[in-house]
Interface confidence: low
């Protein structure tokens, strides 16, 4: 049977139970190298309060859909009285990047998770040429997630002294430059990550090759490497690589750009300091509020709620969207679809599309930027459901009693952008995590 | 104030049953993960059964197919029933909660001792 997601094939995959502090190891298309599970585990479930090792999903009893990914065992499980088999559940969601397996829960039989993922898309156009697993898990099993850095167009510019060549990165993934041909970018070779240009001419200095790795808890490395033997003229007969270094801040602070720290025969240390390198508690809340100890902050945007059907509107040109942010009131014209976010076309009102439900909500604050996030929506023809991304700014002379009101600013690839200053969205800070 | 109390020890002839109750106060029961564990005289604690906080149940091979844990969450109490006891599970047996938001909390214990 051939491997359902190939892209996915090249790398073992983690996902974690924080609640019963159990970490995951997944290998999709063949078996996970981990020797307590077994020669055959496709799914190894690692206890670390009891040091123990079950094998939940077997890679010859695997059974694949274009959307799920079924793992079965020959364990016997007991669940009302039947005799079922343990298995994992893995169900697929079209995303924009190769993304992360999330666990999800498990009953006594089956494990279930959700992985968003180019892979699972219905067609390429999110697809990379080369992209690698962008998320570690610490020491105390939390996730540090960079997927959020990962340009789908241009790249990064890093911050160096040389003013005749330009270093350009992404990361993660390699540099789209069909999608956003930007006169400096357009020359940068297909493939690469770091991108060199001199002039004009632009060289691959690096290509992703292998995942996030994390070094202590608040420093992540990446690596690129040029894969081709062609030595570059320049290079004084090295290879070219790259090493980027993510630091999370000591305390919270607005968003810097990479900075070279480092460059000597064509290998070139980078280091990036954003709280995108921090544990993704830090960052994120699935309420719409963010406080306590761990992050550092306290914000809480529930007052935007709205009651009594009412909801906020926003002219997006052919389209009217109706925002009811912070609760779970339906919005009229999106009614049963529990949508946060409800596109209507003008010129025919009875199109109507969720843009991202309410219970699949993200607050984000991260690099001094506020941001809720709606996804889960309607299919677009792509596979992707759609979703709202809502950047928050600091205004205490909103009008509508400082509440503000939502602005349209762009769709791209069925994600809806809005800005919204609000007396809500200003931050007071606590002291360090 | 949060505390765990072991319940249904005692002495048990080889092959016989038992069922030991741990009752919890003070925690949001169904959030926390349920373990025993098991200490015998002269020798370190050892793990014995697993209750996460969703139903998942797993097992010390010395004891699988004989020990069964589970929990009732409207009397805040998990169970651990043992079968076919052996005079190698004479043991003080310990449960423990633990959860992403607590220390660890530990009962005070309760002595099985299988002996004819």
């Known amino acids: 049977q051939a491997a359902p997601f190939p892209e996915l094939c090249s790398y073992t995959w983690e996902a974690v139970d924080t609640k019963n502090n159990v970490l995951y190891k997944i290998n999709i298309c063949g078996s996970v190298d981990i020797v307590q599970c077994g020669p055959s585990s496709a799914v190894c479930m690692h206890d670390l309060k009891t040091r123990t090792y079950h094998s939940v999903g077997d890679s010859v009893l695997r059974s694949a859909t274009r959307s799920l990914l079924e793992f079965n065992t020959t364990v016997s499980c007991d669940q009302q009285g039947t005799n079922h088999r343990v298995q994992s559940s893995i169900a697929f969601l079209c995303g924009k990047t190769l993304g992360t397996p999330e666990f999800v829960t498990a009953t006594e039989c089956v494990h279930y998770f959700e992985w968003r993922t180019t892979a699972a898309c219905k067609k390429d156009i999110f697809k990379a040429n080369k992209e690698v697993p962008c998320y570690v898990f610490d020491e105390e099993l939390r996730k540090h997630d960079l997927n959020p850095l990962i340009k789908l167009s241009g790249a990064y510019l890093v911050d160096d002294s040389d003013p005749d060549t330009s270093l350009f990165i992404n990361v993660c993934r390699d540099i789209d430059t069909l999608r956003d041909p930007g006169s400096q970018l357009r020359a940068c070779p297909p493939g690469t990550a770091a991108c060199l240009v001199r002039g004009h001419q632009a060289f691959d200095v690096g290509q992703p090759r292998d995942g996030l790795k994390v070094v202590r808890k608040d420093r992540l490395v990446l690596s690129y490497v040029r894969e081709e033997a062609g030595k570059l003229d320049f290079c004084d007969g090295h290879s070219p690589a790259v090493t980027i270094t993510f630091v999370c801040p000591s305390e919270r602070r607005e968003g810097t750009i990479p900075k070279l720290t480092a460059k000597s025969n064509c290998r070139y240390e980078i280091e990036w300091i954003t709280e995108y390198a921090c544990h993704r508690d830090y960052l994120e809340s699935k309420t719409c509020s963010l406080s306590g100890e761990q992050q550092d902050v306290s914000i809480d945007l529930t007052p935007l709620a709205q009651s009594g059907g009412s909801s906020y509107i926003s002219d997006g040109k052919e389209y009217l969207f109706y925002l009811n942010v912070c609760g779970e009131t339906e919005i009229q014209f999106c009614n049963k679809k529990q949508a946060a976010v409800c596109q209507v076309k003008k010129s025919d009102t009875s199109q109507v599309k969720a843009a991202g439900r309410y219970h699949n909500q993200t607050l984000r604050y991260s690099d001094g930027d506020l941001t809720l996030i709606y996804f889960g929506g309607d299919e677009c023809s792509s596979g992707f459901q759609r979703m709202s991304v809502i950047n928050f700014r600091c205004n205490k002379t909103a009008g509508n009693d400082g509440k503000g009101t939502p602005v349209f600013t762009g769709e791209v690839d069925c994600t809806y952008f809005f800005t919204w200053d609000t007396e809500y969205a200003c931050v007071h800070h606590h002291h360090h995590h | 104030d949060v505390q765990l109390v072991e319940s249904g020890g005692g002495l048990v002839q080889p092959g016989g049953s038992l069922r030991l109750s741990c009752a919890a106060s003070?925690?949001?029961?169904?959030?926390?993960?349920m373990d025993w564990y098991r200490q015998a005289p002269g020798k370190q604690r050892e793990w014995v059964a697993t209750?996460?906080?969703?139903?998942?149940?797993t097992y010390a091979d010395s004891v699988k197919g004989r020990f069964t844990i589970s929990r009732d969450n409207a009397k805040n109490t998990v169970y651990l029933q043992m079968n076919s006891l052996r005079p190698e599970d004479t043991a003080v047996y310990y449960c423990k909660a633990s959860s992403p938001v607590l220390n660890d909390i530990w009962g005070q214990g309760t002595l099985v001792t299988v002996s004819s």
């Open positions: 003070g925690i949001i029961f169904s959030d926390n993960r």
């Open positions: 209750l996460a906080s969703y139903g998942w149940k």
